[in-house]
Interface confidence: medium
């Protein structure tokens, strides 16, 4: 019995760099650290068969299946996939191990299945089996986290019922306002489900998995802060848990906090209090109001009162179904070529939306910012002064919303010309949409001042290129102008641009462009 070779099977995940689809033994550019696939000898199989751990791959992901063979001498190999033989070119690494690779670029359903690698070395023959399947991301979910009180402890548990199991982290900040942005040094992240430190200024819990990241903020009323001009509003769907934290700081411990819903004290079991001294020995008290599963009758004004602070309220609204409220009428904007401008959508939504901005079939990330009045705003400034149609799309679990914007850039026309045997056409994308004139250049009119009015056909908005209007003007050929130079001019309030065309037999026409401001 020959000594079996030492074999290592690895999976390398690649960051897609838009390489073409197909199988190849060259390497994509960017790769992650290899993952060991085990490669155990398969029991009760005829011949020597190694089986690698099953590989699950996301649609469109790029991977390399790789086998490292520690066996003396040369090796030859053959890949077989769905009864087709595939080229195999082993090479040797720095440790003189044979390396055989199969690269799968942009994984598709057709590339899923069993990959067999037959290796022949000087000593022995053996087979390695890889099973590659597409990960069923349709079953994936990422749900917004929610809070629960930990049994018998003054602590909150963060729960996100998601597939695959998400990583849960608390995002804590003790500063005010802008300094609590995610990347700020004031922000502390704790990758754990249970949080005991509940006295911070800003407390959020985030869950992340392959589908992204979702966060929930612990709704807080701070009695030491000046109340907002509009009453803070909290939306929840029937059956969701309600958590509101009331926080107050005082010079000593001689004060208490209470919660009321519509002037009635909350029932026992719907609140709990914690307190601590801050470093300067002032007392911080927090009083949580919570309902494990809200019903319609939990709607109302929740008021936190203190014996030493002015009381503050929040309006809790329980809805049957999520919503997105915003005006969906399309909006048109006209700006100068170097004018700073952002599209913006103001909306009120629950649950929080996922959104995208789209232009020219390309999607851009969408950021949202909460406003004091309960509304949120999303702005898009990355238009690079490209005219056209921009689309804002938002959705949550229960609602969808789309809003169209048209951006027009004020600029003088640029003229392009084309000609055929029977007509000449000029096109311009200047804005405001230009007007056209055609002029004939002749001995009588060397400066091309003789205007042509016969046979001219203007189309104000010929074709829409991602919302960008293009104006055109066509001159039908007549005997009177055949063989002459003609000039088409497009003009608007910002200037004029012309193109000169020689009208003769069909073929490539010389175009001479004039720019007249």
């Amino acid at each position: 019995n020959q000594d079996l070779p030492v074999i290592k099977c690895v999976l390398i995940n690649h960051k897609n760099n838009d390489s073409s689809v197909g199988k190849s033994s060259s390497y994509p550019m960017v790769s992650e650290s290899p993952e060991d696939l085990g490669c155990a000898l398969r029991p009760q199989s005829s011949g020597t068969v190694y089986e690698a751990a099953a590989v699950e791959v996301d649609v469109s992901a790029s991977i390399t299946l790789q086998v490292l063979v520690d066996a003396p001498g040369n090796i030859s190999c053959l890949w077989v996939f769905k009864h087709s033989s595939l080229n195999c070119q082993p090479h040797f690494d720095l440790q003189n191990r044979g390396v055989v690779s199969m690269v799968i670029l942009k994984m598709t359903e057709t590339q899923a299945g069993e990959y067999l690698l037959f290796i022949q070395s000087e000593a022995t023959n053996y087979t390695i089996l890889f099973t590659v399947s597409i990960r069923n991301t349709l079953l994936y979910t990422l749900r917004r986290p929610y809070f629960r009180k930990m049994e018998n402890q003054d602590a909150l548990v963060c729960i996100s019922e998601s597939v695959p199991e998400p990583i849960v982290e608390w995002v804590l900040c003790d500063s005010q306002g802008e300094s609590c942005k995610e990347e700020s040094p004031a922000v502390v992240k704790k990758e754990e489900k249970v949080l005991h430190e509940l006295f911070g200024t800003d407390i959020r819990c985030c869950a992340r998995n392959e589908l992204g990241r979702e966060c929930t903020r612990l709704f807080t009323i701070d009695l030491n802060q000046t109340p907002q001009t509009t009453l803070p509003q909290l939306f929840l769907k029937v059956g969701e848990p309600l958590w509101i934290r009331c926080k107050a700081v005082h010079v000593n411990h001689g004060f208490g906090l209470t919660w009321e819903l519509e002037n009635k004290a909350l029932e026992e079991g719907n609140y709990f209090e914690m307190s601590t001294y801050s470093t300067n020995r002032t007392m911080i008290r927090i009083l949580f109001a919570f309902v494990s599963s809200v019903a319609r009758n939990d709607t109302g004004y929740y008021t936190c009162s203190s014996s030493k602070h002015p009381s503050q309220s929040a309006l809790v609204t329980i809805v049957e179904k999520g919503f997105i409220n915003a005006t969906n009428s399309s909006e048109d904007y006209e700006i100068d070529q170097y004018e700073e401008f952002c599209f913006s959508v103001r909306f009120k939504a629950y649950p929080q939306i996922r959104c995208t901005w789209t232009f020219s079939r390309k999607s851009f990330p969408c950021e949202q910012k909460g406003l004091d009045n309960g509304y949120s705003i999303s702005k898009f400034c990355n238009h690079k002064h490209q005219p056209g149609e921009y689309i804002f799309h938002a959705e949550n679990d229960d609602a969808q919303f789309t809003k169209m914007f048209t951006l027009n850039i004020r600029r003088k026309p640029q003229v392009l010309a084309e000609a055929s045997a029977s007509q000449a056409s000029c096109f311009s994308d200047g804005y405001p949409l230009p007007s056209w004139t055609w002029k004939k250049c002749s001995d009588k009119s060397p400066n091309c001042t003789e205007e042509i009015t016969e046979g001219v056909w203007n189309r104000k908005a010929n074709r829409k290129v991602f919302g960008q209007w293009v104006s055109s003007s066509t001159l039908n050929m007549s005997e009177a102008i055949k063989g002459f130079l003609v000039k088409c001019c497009a003009y608007n309030s910002l200037g004029t641009s012309c193109e000169t065309i020689l009208l003769n037999s069909p073929g490539p026409f010389p175009f001479i462009q004039d720019n007249i401001s």
């Epitope: 003054d154 709990f272 914690m274 307190s275 601590t276 001294y277």
Partner: antibody
Framework: QVQLVQSGAEVKKPGASVKVSCKAS????????MDWVRQAPGQGLEWMGR????????TYVQKFQGRVTMTRDTSTSTVYMELSSLRSEDTAVYYC?????????????WGQGTLVTVSS | DIQMTQSPSSLSASVGDRVTITCRAS??????LNWYQQKPGKAPKLLIY???SLQSGVPSRFSGSGSGTDFTLTISSLQPEDFATYYC?????????FGQGTKVEIK
């Protein structure tokens, strides 16, 4: 004014359990933690643990874990401390003490104490 | 656990004397130290919290100082009602721990 009134003295046999009560008045019961401190005859003070009357959450000293249970009844503003599997070294005066903070405790009001004697 | 050590264990003094009791922590406890007075058969009474803050209703002859690991309770002019046992207690980290006590007796 703030008052913490404890139940009367108890004599127990080794292995038995004792439940001491502490009734609070003169302040908002759920706004202050209640701690339990004991003092063996002629000895110093020893902290046993605490309860948050608002939530019922408890923290126990490792030494007493598994033997001590602290509970509260918000309807009567009373906290209870039950100690099981009593041994002779548990003979002590047991005090409830109010503290305004969960993190940095100073005991600003104390009960009068309950003497628990464990003797066969 | 943080160990608290008081000294002296006991002292004799006369009415009008200035009395100083020290308390040392086994690690830094910032200013999270409290002082209590206990008379025989009675519950302890809070005198000083946060190392130097006088609890309301406590006479001003009592004062506290210190930070980190070393703390002092001072009675500027001993009165007859001050003869008692004094305990320090750290409130920096659980379990809260007390010093073994200092007994102030009449000389």
């Amino acid at each position: 004014q703030v008052q913490l009134v404890q139940s009367g003295a108890e004599v127990k046999k080794p292995g038995a359990s004792v439940k001491v009560s502490c009734k609070a008045s003169g302040y908002t019961f759920t706004s202050y933690y209640m701690d339990w401190v004991r003092q063996a005859p002629g000895q110093g003070l020893e902290w046993m643990g605490r309860i948050n009357p608002s939530s019922g959450s408890t923290t126990y000293v490792q030494k007493f874990q598994g033997r001590v249970t602290m509970t509260r009844d918000t309807s009567t503003s009373t906290v209870y401390m039950e100690l099981s599997s009593l041994r002779s070294e548990d003979t002590a005066v047991y005090y409830c003490a109010r503290t305004p903070s969960g993190s940095y405790s100073d005991f600003d009001y104390w009960g009068q104490g309950t003497l628990v004697t464990v003797s066969s | 656990d943080i160990q608290m050590t008081q000294s002296p264990s006991s002292l004799s003094a006369s009415v009008g004397d200035r009395v100083t009791i020290t308390c040392r922590a086994s690690q830094s406890i910032s200013s999270y130290l409290n002082w209590y007075q206990q008379k025989p058969g009675k519950a302890p009474k809070l005198l000083i919290y946060a190392a130097s803050s006088l609890q309301s209703g406590v006479p001003s002859r009592f004062s506290g100082s210190g930070s980190g690991t070393d703390f002092t309770l001072t009675i500027s002019s001993l009165q007859p009602e001050d003869f008692a046992t004094y305990y320090c207690q750290q409130s920096y980290s659980t379990p809260w721990t007390f010093g073994q006590g200092t007994k102030v007796e009449i000389k």
